[in-house]
């Protein structure tokens, strides 16, 4: 053997090296890789050093027997059957209450003839549950409401007004409060005649009686 080069590097089972025919002079870098379904154990990069020894021991290729961590899903909890996700392991996603699952709830780690084990499906998503709308309220008698819809989405506001000569009693604007079910923040208002309101609240009426034989009114004030 030459005494000015590093020793020859062998091939490794279930893997290969590149370059395949490296120069063995100092400074040469050789990278080992594994076939699909195998992973490198040890250092994959070796370098021929000044003292003509390789920087690391020869690596090996080991069969991959588990799936990668499929990760957390926002707005959910997950139940794991085995912490390292070996073949046969399951991960179950359960959406938090108020969220709806889109996709598969349970993923299973499956072995493959060629390549690494793989999850049965991709991780699902948890989407916000659609909030039910509020049913439209009637316009008050002698009044109007805006907008005039039959259904109002959660969070929407409706406004009430009264016809000329009428005043609003209650809230002029009420909101569809999001919830399960959604509900109106206040009861609908009513429209009262402004003149009567003012009249009855500020005056008292005295009734004058006419004497039987007289046509004149004796009004007392």
């Amino acid at each position: 053997p030459r005494n000015d080069t590093c020793p020859e590097l062998p091939e490794i089972p279930n893997g290969w090296k590149s370059p395949s025919q490296p120069e063995l002079v100092h400074g040469t870098v050789v990278t080992y890789q594994c076939y699909p379904g195998y992973q490198v154990v040890g250092s994959s990069v070796l370098m021929c050093q000044w003292d003509l020894t390789w920087s690391e021991d020869l690596p090996s290729c080991q069969r991959v027997t588990s799936c990668h961590d499929p990760g957390d899903v926002e707005h959910s909890r997950r139940l794991i059957s085995s912490p390292k996700f070996p073949v046969g392991a399951t991960v179950q996603y359960i959406c938090d209450q108020g969220f709806v699952l889109m996709g598969s709830s349970i993923l299973t780690c499956h072995d493959r003839q060629a390549g690494s084990p793989k999850w049965s499906d991709r991780a699902p998503k948890c989407l916000l549950e659609q909030l039910k709308p509020c049913h439209g309220l009637s316009a008050p008698e002698n009044g109007a409401r805006s907008p005039e819809k039959q259904l109002h989405p959660a969070g929407a506001t409706i406004h009430f007004s009264c016809a000329p000569g009428y005043v609003l009693k209650g809230q002029a604007s009420i909101k569809c409060v999001p919830g399960h079910p959604s509900h109106w923040s206040d009861p609908p208002p009513i429209c009262r005649a402004a003149s009567l309101d003012g009249f009855y609240n500020s005056r008292s009426l005295d009734v004058a009686k006419a004497p039987a034989a007289s046509s004149t009114l004796d009004a007392a004030h």
Partner: antibody, heavy 116, light 106 residues
């Protein structure tokens, strides 16, 4: 009638481990997750974690990760919870509970006392 | 995690009186659940999904609320209603329970 029958009271020394059981009856055991809930004397409730009896999948409250381990035996419709490295803080009543988002059936509770 | 604060911590009511207890969440939740517990017994599911009564719960009980504010109301207090009540959410993991309201009879 749905029933969750829990094992009896336990008196343990600090540093020891304890395993309590919960036998389910009156429904299909694998159809509902089993949860464990802790209640300190006269205090509020704390969720420890849950197990899916069908897959054996578990989920834990981070606070109890490493402290509690939940398992099931499908053949006897029994859920188990082991608590390790016990301290006086672990003295409490432990309930096994059935549920998904709320807890509809509760066991009678297992009282654990940790004392030297 | 979401913190649930119940108020009042302790309250007393006379038979026939209307009772309201509240549960305030540190973040918005979609639903609230309530449990009743009497001394020396396990908690019982009482109200679920904010307003649904569990089977066997008298109609004088009701639940309402949305967002961060929920309440349990008893329209007319009865002796058997004296107990400890807990609210609970699972709109966010881990699920959490409220700090407790103890209802006593006057």
């Amino acid at each position: 009638e749905v029933q969750l029958q829990q094992s009896g009271p336990e008196l343990m020394k600090p540093g020891a481990s304890v395993k309590m059981s919960c036998k389910a009856s009156g429904y299909t055991f694998t159809d509902h997750n089993i949860h464990w809930v802790k209640q300190h004397q006269g205090k509020s409730l704390e969720w420890i974690g849950e197990i899916n009896p069908n897959t054996g999948g578990t989920g834990y409250n981070q606070k109890f990760q490493g402290k509690a381990t939940m398992t099931v035996d499908k053949s006897s419709s029994t859920a188990y919870m082991e608590l390790r490295s016990l301290t006086s803080e672990d003295s409490a009543v432990y309930y096994c509970v059935r549920g998904l988002y709320f807890f509809d059936y509760w066991g009678q509770g297992t009282t654990l006392t940790v004392s030297s | 995690q979401i913190v649930l604060t119940q108020s009042p911590a302790i309250m007393s009511a006379s038979p026939g009186e209307k009772v309201t207890m509240t549960c305030s969440a540190s973040s918005s939740v979609s639903y609230m659940h309530w449990y009743q517990q009497k001394s020396g017994t396990s908690p019982k599911r009482w109200i679920y999904d904010t307003s649904k009564l569990a089977s066997g719960v008298p109609a004088r009980f009701s639940g309402s609320g949305s967002g961060t504010s929920y309440s349990l109301t008893i329209s007319s207090m009865e002796t058997e209603d004296a107990a400890t009540y807990y609210c609970q959410q699972w709109s966010n993991t881990p699920p959490t329970f409220g700090s407790v309201t103890k209802l006593e009879i006057k």
